[in-house]
């Protein structure tokens, strides 16, 4: 069952899905000047069984101007992500969550994809929130939202996260994004 709405927006916060439930669809969109190859699927689909899940189909974009140009192919997501997970295992803060059975990892970039990815989430999907640069988290509960089915309708739970105003590093050393600083040190982050 697909979720009807988008996850809730939280002021000064951004969310991601760490992993995608089986049944999730990702539109194969290309950036301006490129189009999906004629034989290409319009979406990728997370499929699998209890032990292994992966994305069916690959998004491929080609120049709108050129005919019969070389296909741009997505690297195999499982292969890319398995290598990534092995390389970074010691630093993975979300290792338990990203290894969930029945879930697919974020597909790696494909050439000339659209700026924004459009996912069609299914019931049971969780997305995780973080405060953006310059804001710090006040937690009342989990900073996540889950798509649930209630009385035949889908809804997203409200994440218990408030991102409070710009912090002065000199005033509050180490307090920027405290919910996710594995090293506990304030880092430098600026926006143009």
């Amino acid at each position: 069952e697909l979720c009807d709405d988008d996850p809730p927006k939280i002021t000064h916060a951004t969310f991601k899905a760490v992993a995608y439930k089986e049944g999730t669809m990702l539109n194969c969109e290309c950036k301006r000047g490129f189009r999906r190859i004629k034989s290409g699927s319009p979406y990728m689909l997370c499929t699998g069984n209890s032990s292994h899940s992966s994305w069916d189909n690959q998004c491929q974009c080609t120049s709108s101007a050129a005919r019969n140009t070389t296909k741009q192919v997505t690297p195999q997501p499982e292969e890319q992500k398995e290598r990534k997970t092995t390389e970074m295992q010691s630093q993975m803060q979300l290792a338990d969550q990203v290894s969930l059975p029945g879930h697919c990892r974020e597909p790696p970039p494909w050439e000339n994809e659209a700026t924004e990815r459009i996912y069609h989430f299914v019931v049971g999907q969780t997305v995780y929130y973080q405060c953006v640069q310059g804001y710090r988290a006040l937690h009342r509960g989990p900073a996540e939202s889950v798509c649930k089915m209630t009385h035949g309708k889908t809804r997203w739970t409200q994440p218990q996260l408030i991102c409070t105003g710009e912090t002065e590093p000199s005033q509050f050393p180490g307090e920027e994004e405290p919910q996710a600083s594995p090293d506990g040190l304030p880092e430098s982050e600026t926006s143009r």
Partner: nanobody, 130 residues
Framework: QLQLVESGGGLVQAGGSLRLSCAAS????????IGWFRQAPGKEREGVSY????????YYINSVKGRFTISSDNAKSTVYLQMNTLKPEDTAVYYC???????????????????????WGKGTQVTVSS
């Protein structure tokens, strides 16, 4: 297949400079945070710096602040790391990496620090001699 190709590493004396480049032909920069990790012998890989393709937000780990500068040329699909006043402790293999932005084209440095990236380069060696 989309790949990240690093260049610009080498051997330099303490106090010297290097400029690393990461070419990502075909990558839609506006949808990603792009930047650098490093791994010194016997140490864990750490996120050094990133820049977001959406609005140019930059991030630096404490130990390089004021010495390293990250920049991007979206037209050339390339990210640069200008490294000045290099120290022996900067010796490491430097890896280019990209990570998908979050909702509304925003990014949180916590994601970079977690090291869970969507794509990695093969790395370039930087050696700073004393």
């Amino acid at each position: 297949q989309l790949q990240l190709v690093e260049s610009g590493g080498g051997l330099v004396q303490a106090g010297g400079s290097l400029r690393l480049s990461c070419a990502a032909s075909g990558l839609t920069f506006e949808g990603y945070a792009i930047g650098w990790f490093r791994q010194a012998p016997g140490k864990e890989r750490e996120g050094v710096s990133y820049i977001t393709g959406s609005d140019g937000t930059t991030y630096y780990i404490n130990s390089v602040k004021g010495r390293f500068t990250i920049s991007s040329d979206n037209a050339k699909s390339t990210v640069y790391l200008q490294m000045n006043t290099l120290k022996p402790e900067d010796t490491a293999v430097y890896y280019c990496a990209v990570d998908r932005l979050g909702s509304q084209g925003r990014y949180a440095s916590a994601w970079w620090r977690s090291g869970d990236m969507d794509l990695w380069g093969k790395g370039t060696q930087v050696t700073v001699s004393s």
